[in-house]
């Protein structure tokens, strides 16, 4: 899509901070009086040349887009306004990292795209790590252990944070059925300085892509941009995505017919929102209005109880959340392949849980 | 003298929608910012978002995207705020304000409109 | 985004005092501040930029300081004319935020 808005956000940042240079005199407004240093022309024209070079990526999907030609037109004007030659420096975007205390440590500077390596070296010790996961009919394990069935439709937040977006989008199981499964998962991983250019990842059921929706499989040309990349296993029904510039790995499956999600994010990283940004699945749950219990079921097809708990127990011998949830979700949809999503689930909690005591969690209902 | 003269006072309904206008003489209006601060009131200021016409592009804060649309026509050298959606906690004095360096929101807002007063009440 | 919290909330001095007003930022912003005063009723007026930088016609008692979280404005000798209420904003990020506003009374 037209990405015209992603560049002018870009210039807009990389604008705020320049100061002094140039002919400044000149691009004071007539409002207060004169003031000296301020934005100087040769800053200025590092921005437009790099807005204009952004314009020119995107160019191709914004034909007929009103505000990416009155842009075009705008920073050809400034440039001409300001004697800016075509070919020269480019800003940089401006710096988003996770903040990060001590960086005038006296050691050389630790990689920026690395997290948890510079994480390490400024702390003195590995970030903190949480795991939320999102599967089945689809139950929420949230960071803090919650574990919650959810009744939602349509597209809900299980992340909204300074550097990632994801969104479940869910619809019922079968016609008439209370409980959901989610069919397709969007992610969006947010532009970073000297990491990755935005890129947006975006899975439906029987279409699992290993590459992000611009084709490519890492982070873009910046420097850092190996510091995010997709790979997979299994083409069709698992892909891995790891970002370690803010030290995320994220998985998900396909199984029956429903999409799963997993991941693992560091502490810093996963709670760097803001109050506006309170609706995630991931750090509350699911809202209590949107929760079910597991009283609440109305069962399809042949499959009893006994041979529901006997189908999940097979793969899942602690009766915890897990298993509960499995149980659940064969019930309702009628579908033994169900069994597959809590077992991956709970296996991916496996890999992900920094507290491995955490691991099985005990619904009270 | 760069000068920025508001629409007048609104009272609206619950649910509604307000467009403020902001309009600029006796300086250059198109590749200066504007940008929209509201105050509720015996509150603080909070930005909503901003445009720099000459780009036509609008930049909000997140807390009012999709709520918020800010426009300039600089045929008339004039910007416009629009909120939809209002509810009484939208009750506040709407201020459009002009950047104080071209092509920048950066160093402050030089140039300030009067304030136009906007009520939400059923 | 970025917080900005100043202190106090307000205040009350007799005029010819000095009067401090502290402003911080939840990240390092540098010197990218600005002071506004706001007389009741009135818009906003810039009075200082780039943390310590008087924006011209702006009387030379009111002075500001500080770099990366923590700022100072400060009235060298209060006037009556003074009376009004003092913001903090930062401008290294969008959206650029206010710090709650210092009211300042004579007493």
């Known amino acids: 899509q037209c990405k015209i808005l992603r560049c002018n956000a870009e210039y807009v940042s990389s604008t705020l901070s320049l100061r002094g240079g140039g002919s400044s005199g000149a691009l004071r407004g007539g409002g207060g009086g004169g003031r000296g240093g301020g934005v100087g022309s040769g800053g200025l024209c590092r921005a437009l040349r790099s807005y204009a070079l952004c314009t020119r990526r995107t160019a191709r999907t914004c034909r007929g887009d009103l505000a990416f030609h009155s842009a075009v037109h705008g920073i050809e004007d400034l440039m001409i306004q300001h004697n800016c030659s075509r070919q020269g420096p480019t800003a940089p975007p401006p710096p988003r990292g996770p903040a990060l205390p001590g960086a005038g440590s006296g050691l050389p500077a630790p990689d920026p795209c690395d997290y948890e390596g510079r994480f390490s070296r400024l702390h003195g010790r590995p970030p903190g790590f949480l795991h939320c996961a999102s599967f089945g009919d689809p139950h929420v394990r949230s960071f803090h252990h919650h574990f919650h069935t959810c009744r939602v439709q349509g597209a809900w937040p299980l992340l909204d944070n300074d550097f990632l977006f994801v969104q479940a989008t869910s619809s019922p199981m079968a016609l008439g059925a209370n409980a959901t499964a989610t069919r397709k998962l969007t992610i969006i991983f947010k532009n970073m300085q000297e990491c990755i250019d935005q890129k947006v990842y975006q899975a439906e059921v029987d279409n699992l892509p290993v590459a992000f929706e611009d084709g490519s499989i890492n982070g873009g040309d910046r420097p850092g941009g190996s510091s995010l990349s997709i790979q997979t296993a299994n083409p069709g029904n698992h892909v891995e995505i790891q970002a370690a510039y803010i030290g995320t790995t994220i998985i998900i499956r396909q199984t029956a017919g429903q999409l799963s999600f997993s991941i693992k994010v560091a502490e810093d990283v996963a709670m760097a929102f803001s109050a506006e940004q309170d609706l995630q699945l991931c750090v509350g749950g699911c809202p209590p209005s949107q929760r079910l219990s597991r009283s609440e079921r109305n069962r399809r097809g042949a499959i009893t109880i006994d041979t529901a708990r006997r189908l999940c127990k097979e793969g899942l011998p602690v009766e915890d959340a897990y298993f509960h949830s499995c149980v659940f979700d064969v019930l309702i949809s009628g579908d033994p392949n169900f069994t597959v999503a809590a077992q991956a689930a709970l296996e991916d909690a496996r890999a992900f849980l920094p507290d491995l005591e955490k691991l099985h969690l005990f619904p009270s209902d | 003298q760069v000068q920025l003269v508001q629409s007048g006072a609104e009272v609206k309904k619950p649910g509604s929608s307000v467009k403020v206008s902001c309009k600029a003489s006796g300086g250059t209006f198109r590749s200066y910012s504007i940008s929209w601060v509201r105050q509720a009131p015996g509150q603080g200021l909070e930005w909503m978002g901003g445009?720099?016409?000459?780009?036509?592009?609008?930049n909000y804060a997140q807390k009012f995207q999709g709520r918020v649309t800010i426009t300039a026509d600089e045929s008339t050298s004039t910007a416009y705020m629009e909120l939809s959606s209002l509810r009484s906690e939208d009750t506040a004095v709407y201020y459009c304000?002009?950047?104080?360096?071209?092509?920048?929101?950066?160093?402050?807002?030089?140039?300030w409109g009067q304030g136009t007063t906007v009520t939400v009440s059923s | 985004d970025i917080q900005m919290t100043q202190s106090p909330s307000s205040l009350s001095a007799s005029v010819g005092d000095r009067v401090t007003i502290t402003c911080q930022a939840s990240q390092d912003i540098s010197n990218y501040l600005n002071w506004y005063q706001q007389k009741p009723g009135k818009a906003p007026k810039l009075l200082i930029y780039?943390?310590?930088n008087l924006e011209t016609g702006v009387p030379s008692r009111f002075s500001g300081s500080g770099s990366g979280t923590d700022f100072t404005f400060t009235i060298s000798s209060l006037q009556p004319e003074d009376i009004a209420t003092y913001y903090c904003q930062q401008l290294v990020d969008l959206p650029p935020t206010f710090g709650g506003g210092t009211k300042v009374e004579i007493k």
């Open positions: 780039d943390a310590s």
């Open positions: 445009i720099i016409p000459i780009f036509g592009v609008a």
């Open positions: 304000a002009r950047g104080a360096y071209e092509a920048t929101y950066g160093l402050g807002m030089d140039v």
